[in-house]
């Protein structure tokens, strides 16, 4: 229940990607506004997003103090220009939100190629270690950072003159693989973790193959 | 509870073609890479291939790169391995795997394909 | 291709012995190994992954051990339920590749 003229959120929904993460709901707000509220489990409720008319609160500044605890989030609905107006029970119409965990939950996002290079028949291919917004000692920590060796990533590669794939893995952020002399190669990775049983893979990385501009040669 | 169930198998002449199918319960293939293993009588276990059914790529033993095809009908949360040209030495128990990326932590029972004329 | 060589390929032991699988990978495989069981007519179950990680639900009495290229399964104490066969497998980089077997049989 609540005042005749509010209704409650609804589709309470938490979309996160190494950690940024936002909750969204709906509905589009009719004379009405929202305010978020954040708490771990334990803890004490925080406001974020007073009185806004968006459908989206920003909670990243929140979820990073503590990636691995778990999070659940409150989306109050007041009339348009009476905020102390409460419901029928005395307090203001409200929602909530599943429970978060982002250290198990966050989706993986996109990873990205940082460079390769031949020497002889072994090439070295290197993730770029993306910079989270979880911090530590005043510096933002990267996703390896974050997730240690629970982190892997998958290498497809295949010659650029045939279409059969290879795969390999590695804990750390770079691949050092066999290839046949004077072949060009094509390269895609894939962030994974094994242990989630949720979110565990990362969509591929965009292709790069030998002879662009990311690679460098040595006999 | 995670179940994968194989299907398909059966008495193939050779030369001829067989697919078969792992249906899934339990979980989704998308979040997994799905593998095809298999075991000829009194042997070892054999790498076929395997499928990241949510993207699509499919990686395989180049020894069945020819004849091999793995797909996923993820609608229908089942992970497919078709083989072509079979011979006599193809006769095996194949079973479908699925891989957390560290370990296969559930395999189906298998399904027997009998290649002989 | 990595070639997997394990040995032995059989062995008779009796319950409460302790009892060691090796496994040699042609290169490093960086500890991308892992070790299964199988009993007959069953599908296989894993025991060790990452070459000396225990798998959930799996009795202490196993463990894994090695790095590189040597790869250690050790049965502290064999008991009824242990006579299988057992297989290491690498997965590092394609094609997948798993040792011959090792038979484990009642002395």
């Known amino acids: 229940s609540g005042t005749t003229n509010t209704v409650a959120a609804y589709n309470l929904t938490w979309k996160s990607t190494n950690f940024k993460t936002i909750l969204e709901w709906e509905p589009k707000p009719v004379n009405q506004v929202y305010t978020v509220q954040i708490s771990t489990k334990s803890g004490d409720w925080k406001s974020k997003c007073f009185y806004t008319t968006d459908t989206e609160c920003d909670l990243t500044d929140e979820i990073v103090k503590d990636v691995k605890q778990t999070y659940l989030a409150r989306v109050f609905s007041y009339p348009a220009g009476n905020v102390e107006s409460t419901g029928s029970a005395g307090e203001p119409l409200y929602e909530n939100s599943p429970e978060f965990t982002p250290y198990l939950e966050t989706n993986l996002g996109q990873p990205t190629i940082q460079s390769f290079e031949q020497v002889g028949t072994k090439v070295n291919v290197t993730v770029e270690d993306e910079r989270t917004l979880v911090r530590r000692n005043n510096t933002f920590l990267s996703l390896r950072d974050v997730f240690g060796k629970d982190l892997i990533y998958t290498l497809y590669y295949w010659k650029s003159s045939s279409s059969g794939k290879k795969t390999a893995k590695t804990n750390t952020n770079e691949f050092l693989i066999d290839v046949d002399k004077g072949e060009n190669y094509c390269f895609s990775v894939q962030a994974v973790i094994p242990s989630r049983t949720v979110n565990r893979k990362s969509t591929d990385s965009p292709v790069e193959c030998m002879g662009q501009e990311k690679g460098e040669f040595r006999e | 509870e995670v179940q994968l169930v194989e299907s398909g198998g059966g008495l193939v002449q050779p030369g001829g073609s067989l697919r078969l199918s792992c249906a899934a319960s339990g979980f989704n293939i998308k979040e997994y890479y799905m593998h095809w293993v298999r075991q000829a009588p009194g042997k070892g276990l054999e790498w076929v291939g395997l499928i990241d059914p949510e993207q699509g790529n499919t990686i395989y033993d180049p020894k069945f790169q020819d004849r091999a095809t793995i797909s996923a009908d993820n609608s229908k949360n089942t992970a497919y391995l078709q083989m072509n040209s079979l011979r006599a030495e193809d006769t095996a128990v194949y079973y479908c795997?699925?891989?957390?990326?560290?370990?296969?932590?559930?395999v189906g029972q298998g399904t027997l394909v009998t290649v002989s004329s | 291709d990595i070639q997997m060589t394990q040995s032995p390929s059989s062995l008779s032991a009796s319950v409460g012995d302790r009892v060691t699988i090796t496994c040699r990978a042609s290169r490093d495989i960086k500890s991308y190994l892992n070790w299964y069981q199988q009993k007959p007519g069953k599908a296989w179950k894993v025991l060790i992954y990452y070459a000396t990680s225990l798998a959930e639900g799996v009795p202490s009495r196993f463990s894994g051990s090695g790095s590189g290229t040597d790869y250690t399964l050790t049965i502290s104490s064999l008991q009824p339920e242990d006579f299988a066969t057992y297989y290491c497998w690498q997965h590092g980089e394609s094609p997948w590749t798993a040792g011959q077997g090792t038979k484990v049989e009642i002395k």
């Open positions: 795997a699925r891989d957390t990326a560290a370990y296969f932590d559930y």
